[in-house]
């Protein structure tokens, strides 16, 4: 196993990401040597700088995106898949991940999932609460979903270390980030903490331990005393705008 690099009280192992691609073919045995993940799909790209962002599953895209073949609305079909913008309320969908945050896929349509639509006691609990009586009408299409609403217990936000599907599943100050073959709630990064910045879109490779993004008012920038370092080893930290 690789040696741990311990920075800012986070055990993160660094591996230079391979160029291009989403880092691993479906079904392939992936090495257990983790790197760190990108800052969430096309979230930080401007329109004039837009490049298709390759992905293998919804989890690799931003919270306002889903993974799909550009010519089709569904992930999992043959060919290259990229991160596409999520679908707004009342738009057609095939799974929850296709709908924008605050919505879920019901009967093929993106519907609001805010709790005011459910009487207390009938509110459905999110995936992070680990109950799984999910018989959603959108289920069974064979595609990965990002939001599952299940059970009869009042929804509570996931604490650090809880399984999640998107950041809205997590408590304040936490984001939903990849961790091994799952996603868990992790702390949003504070000032001075090491962050991940990938210049080359689609170069995030295989990353097992994803870092959260920088907190409000912070940006992921090269640490000043690391300017002389080689390109590959430049350290990025969360800094004030």
């Amino acid at each position: 196993t690789l040696n741990s690099v311990l920075i800012n009280s986070n055990a993160i192992k660094n591996l230079p990401p391979p160029l291009g691609g989403a880092g691993g073919q479906p079904g392939s045995a992936v090495s257990v040597a983790p790197g760190v993940l990108y800052e969430g799909g096309n979230k930080y790209q401007t329109l004039d700088n837009y490049q298709p962002y390759p992905c293998a599953e919804d989890e690799e895209c931003g919270s306002d995106e889903y993974c799909s073949s550009p010519s089709r609305g569904a992930a999992g079909v043959g060919g290259v898949q990229i991160c596409l913008a999520c679908r707004k309320r009342r738009k057609r969908c095939m799974r929850h991940a296709m709908c924008c945050p605050g919505n879920y896929c019901k009967n093929g349509i993106c519907m609001p999932s805010d709790h005011s639509h459910f009487p207390r006691g009938e509110i459905e609990e999110s995936i992070i609460e680990n109950l799984g009586n999910d018989h959603n009408a959108a289920a069974g299409d064979g595609y990965p979903r990002r939001t599952t609403l299940t059970s009869k217990i009042y929804h509570t936000k996931g604490q650090e270390g809880s399984v999640c599907l998107r950041s809205s599943d997590c408590a304040a100050g936490l984001c939903c980030a990849r961790h091994f073959w799952s996603k868990i709630c992790k702390p949003v990064l504070k000032e001075g903490q090491v962050c991940t910045k990938h210049k080359r879109k689609g170069s995030h490779g295989l990353e097992i331990f994803q870092r959260c993004y920088c907190g409000e008012g912070l940006a992921c920038r090269i640490q000043k005393d690391h300017h002389q370092a080689s390109n590959s080893s430049r350290l990025h930290t969360c800094q004030r705008h």
């Epitope: 986070n10 055990a11 691993g24 040597a33 009586n133 595609y143 091994f180 073959w181």
Partner: antibody, heavy 115, light 108 residues
């Protein structure tokens, strides 16, 4: 309710192969990463392998890497563990479980590797 | 690999007593990525605690988890007859995922 049911265990000779299955129900299967854990007779728990919700990413313990293959068929709500080049030390009850901390477990299936 | 050492190996207590089980990691976990399981003979394990201190669905309030860094604790405030079992801790913060060797809680 959530149910995980393993099958495919049995007696096999060293060097042989087995394919374990885990049928899942009661939850949206492809929302969850899945895990295989084993327990040798009278011993503790050992993580074996894990797979992401879509099946795109797979992970293995060093002790089984190159010999075992985890996979899933989301259309059938089924998780698999293909075990090749089996050794005596692979003898154990194999459990499938849901997600990275295992919130639901199957009842287990016994794999015995012996000549 | 992170080695989890559970102590004591066996805990002999009477119903109604408080049980304190320890799980010590060989390296700092840095984040509360630790779970506790209960296993009875001939049965599959059952998740009790995840994220070091979050009770899993349906787990009675007498079970609580605490700790950070290298030292974690599972406390059963008042033992019920059905609590006599073996308890395992598991870390999911670093690769590979590892379990402790278990603590058996037996009736005194």
């Amino acid at each position: 309710q959530v149910q995980l049911v393993e099958s495919g265990g049995g007696l096999v000779q060293p060097g042989g192969s087995l394919r374990l299955s885990c049928a899942a129900s009661g939850f949206t299967f492809n929302n969850y990463g899945m895990t295989w854990v084993r327990q040798a007779p009278g011993k503790g728990l050992e993580w074996v392998s894990g797979i992401s919700g879509s099946g795109s990413y797979t992970y293995y313990a060093d002790s089984v890497k190159g010999r075992f293959t985890i996979s899933r068929d989301n259309s059938k709500n089924t998780l698999y563990l293909q075990m090749n080049s089996l050794r005596a030390e692979d003898t154990a009850v194999y459990y499938c479980a849901r997600t990275i901390y295992m919130d639901y477990w199957g009842q287990g299936t016994l794999v015995t590797v012996s000549s | 690999d992170i080695v989890l050492t559970q102590s004591p190996a066996t805990l002999s207590l009477s119903p109604g007593e408080r049980a304190t089980l320890s799980c010590r990691a060989s390296q700092n976990l840095f984040s509360p990525y630790l779970a506790w399981y209960q296993q009875k003979p001939g049965q599959a394990p059952r998740l009790l605690i995840y994220g070091a201190s979050n009770r899993a669905t349906g787990v009675p309030a007498r079970f609580s988890g605490s700790g950070s860094g290298t030292d974690f604790t599972l406390t059963i405030s008042s033992l019920e007859p059905e609590d006599f079992a073996t308890y395992y801790c598991q870390q999911y913060g670093d690769e590979p995922i590892t379990f402790g060797q278990g603590t058996k809680v037996e009736i005194k």
